[in-house]
């Protein structure tokens, strides 16, 4: 019975035309939903005045339906057992998730500001982008719309900027109508054990942000993992969000909707220092704001985002060092709803629930020769929004998977 | 547009000390660093220093560190430079230039002889 | 300091020649190099700013080039108007350096 059934499952797991797992994989059956909880700034004038604390509070969620969108440009390759696809990005407002408008305004870093002021980091050009910034009206914080702020605004500093630069910032700009890959992964034809494994995502084994493993692209998606999940297994993924592969290890066994999944959770030694867990050395890529690679919780994803100083934590600095979250008040980090957790079905490998959880924070620092950067006398890591992306296998679904899958075995 | 309207040429004594001064008009004048430079007939360009006129900050090249002395005077837009123990080294066209996109408006200059 | 060593201090050209003004730094500066041009009795005007970005209406026959520690200036196409002299200036490190200059004077 058991080999009938590892025999059936190992067939509907590949990733090729006419099986279950394909289906599924080439357009998601589950809806997702993206949260969004923006950092209003209560205190501008303070913080930039008196380098007080930053007062910020969240405000949301904001709900955008995503991953509804068909993988594009799907592509066998029967040489090397792998299919290739992009997948494209597209998010739709959902009012009635959402505590407001796609109209509502924040009061949040000046992105342009403190980007510009970290990549260009001569004393002189310091000078001009002084002038600029004060031409433009422009300061250290700024009002947004949500919309302007996650999708994108043309911004009256950077239009100035005599350079051929892109003048249109936003937190996910651009989004609509682009694509994350190519990515290519194997479909399990000759080892069902690689299913769904990345082999290559834009042509490379290496991502070249990072130095040494921390470079390496490992696992799947997270979409789903090769079948017969074990509680004792680290499950690694790669996350394009964050620029880097990372991994989840066995919680709890969960009922979900009457499957028995196992909850797999992002720990917190995944986020630790190099100090703490010496595996993260190579994730630590510069000593200042890293305080000797001591500070941990936050990852400096600059690299990946064209020099901009953009960090990622886990929201409101859940598992970061005090140093970090010291000049933000109103953070109040909780694990239950701040990190991350996958919810498997071990047999399948397929994954029927999730929570990815991550914030968006951007370096600030002073800066003698910028005006609205001047009377700053340390740097801060300002969290700007964070998300929770989630998604949870529909009843239709769960019944037919009951009936199909684990009623078969049990 | 922006206008610098640099004092008057001077003529003064070895030993003495003189304030030159720079108006500025048709922007924020303390929005922008102002620049101050020196040009001895062919001897090419020097920059003396700069200086924040939203707070006086001043930065100077370390050649002219107790030589020159840069100031502001924030309700006339004036930048002033002052010039200590005057030598004939010291004869000079002296420009300021405030920083836009780099040191794009220099004014007419202020010439100073140094002469017993 | 930064020394820029403007080697030519005369360049003889005739209108309509291609004329190219060098400037090389004692050290690396990348490509925080700005070109100047002082007519007589004037002030200096900027060209040129980061080795190789015309300002904003400057006549498209003014070119920068360069990064690291070689650039030039080329002014094709000559003018009578151009005949003025030439200054470089570094803006990577403090002090701001400038070199010596280089007049450009009709043969």
């Known amino acids: 019975g058991d080999l009938l059934i590892q025999k059936t499952i190992k067939k509907q797991v590949v990733l090729e035309e006419g099986t279950i797992a394909f289906k599924n994989w080439v357009k998601t059956g589950t809806e997702v939903y993206r949260q969004f909880w923006i950092f209003d700034v209560q205190n501008p004038q303070e913080v930039m005045m008196n380098s007080s604390n930053i007062q910020v509070k969240q405000r949301g969620p904001y709900t955008y339906r995503v991953r509804f969108l068909a993988k594009e440009n799907v592509t066998q390759d029967a040489e090397d057992n792998t299919v290739s696809f992009l997948q494209p990005n597209g998010a739709i407002f959902e009012p009635s998730l959402s505590v407001g408008t796609e109209a509502d305004n924040f009061t949040v870093l000046n992105l342009a500001v403190a980007a510009a002021s970290h990549i260009y980091q001569n004393q002189f050009v310091q000078m001009i982008l002084n002038s600029l910034i004060n031409k433009s009206k422009s300061s250290m914080f700024q009002v947004r719309t949500l919309r302007e702020l996650l999708w994108g605004y043309r911004d009256p500093f950077l239009s100035l900027v005599p350079y051929p630069v892109t003048t249109t910032v936003g937190l996910f700009y651009p989004y609509n109508n682009t694509a994350d890959g190519v990515y290519k992964v194997f479909n399990g034809k000759d080892n069902i054990s690689k299913v769904a494994i990345i082999d290559t995502y834009k042509g490379k084994r290496n991502l070249s942000y990072w130095e040494s493993h921390c470079d390496m692209i490992n696992g799947t998606d997270a979409a789903s993992f090769p079948p017969f999940v074990e509680k004792s297994q680290v499950l690694q993924f790669f996350s394009s969000d964050i620029c880097r592969s990372i991994y989840a290890v066995f919680e709890s066994d969960v009922n979900l909707k009457g499957i028995p999944v196992y909850r797999f959770v992002l720990p917190s030694k995944a986020f630790a220092s190099p100090v703490e867990n010496p595996d993260n050395y190579c994730f630590c890529t510069e000593k200042i704001i890293s305080k000797n690679c001591t500070s941990y919780g936050v990852l400096d994803i600059s690299k990946c985002k064209e020099g901009r100083p953009v960090y990622i934590s886990l929201p409101h600095f859940l598992y970061a060092s005090p140093d970090v979250s010291e000049p933000i008040d109103g953070l109040n980090p909780n694990e239950e709803e701040h990190r991350t957790y996958l919810d498997i079905e071990p047999i399948t490998g397929f994954t029927l629930q999730f929570a990815k959880r991550l914030q968006v924070n951007l370096l600030v620092k002073p800066s003698e020769k910028i005006q609205v950067l001047k009377n700053l006398k340390r740097n801060y890591i300002v969290p700007i929004l964070w998300l929770n992306e989630t998604g949870t296998i529909g009843d239709e679904k769960a019944n037919m998977f009951r009936s199909q899958v684990t009623g078969k075995i049990n | 547009q922006v206008q610098l309207q640099q004092s008057g040429a001077e003529l003064v004594k070895p030993g003495a000390s003189v304030k030159l001064s720079c108006k500025a008009s048709?922007?924020?004048?303390?929005?922008?660093?102002m620049h101050w430079v020196k040009q001895r007939p062919g001897q090419g360009l020097e920059w003396i220093g700069e200086?924040?006129?939203?707070?006086?900050?001043?930065n100077y090249n370390q050649k002219f560190k107790g030589k020159a002395t840069l100031t502001v005077d924030k309700s006339s837009s004036t930048a002033y430079m002052q010039l200590s123990s005057l030598t004939s080294e010291d004869s000079a066209v002296y420009y300021c230039?405030?920083?836009?996109?780099?040191?794009?408006?220099w004014g007419q200059g202020t010439t100073l002889t140094v002469s017993s | 300091d930064i020394v820029m060593t403007q080697s030519q201090k005369f360049l003889s050209t005739s209108v309509g020649d291609r004329v190219s003004v060098t400037c090389k730094a004692s050290?690396?500066?990348?490509?925080?190099v700005a070109w100047y041009q002082q007519k007589p009795g004037q002030s200096p005007k900027v060209l040129i700013y980061s080795a190789s970005y015309r300002y904003s209406g400057v006549p498209d026959r003014f070119t920068g080039s360069g990064s690291g520690t070689d650039f030039t200036l080329t002014v094709s196409n000559v003018q009578s108007e151009d005949l003025a002299e030439y200054f470089c200036q570094q803006y990577n490190n403090y002090p701001l350096t400038f070199g010596a200059g280089t007049k450009l004077e009709l043969k």
């Open positions: 200086i924040d006129p939203s707070d006086s900050h001043a």
């Open positions: 048709g922007y924020t004048f303390t929005s922008y660093w």
């Open positions: 230039a405030p920083i836009y996109y780099g040191l794009d408006n």
């Open positions: 050290q690396n500066v990348g490509t925080n």
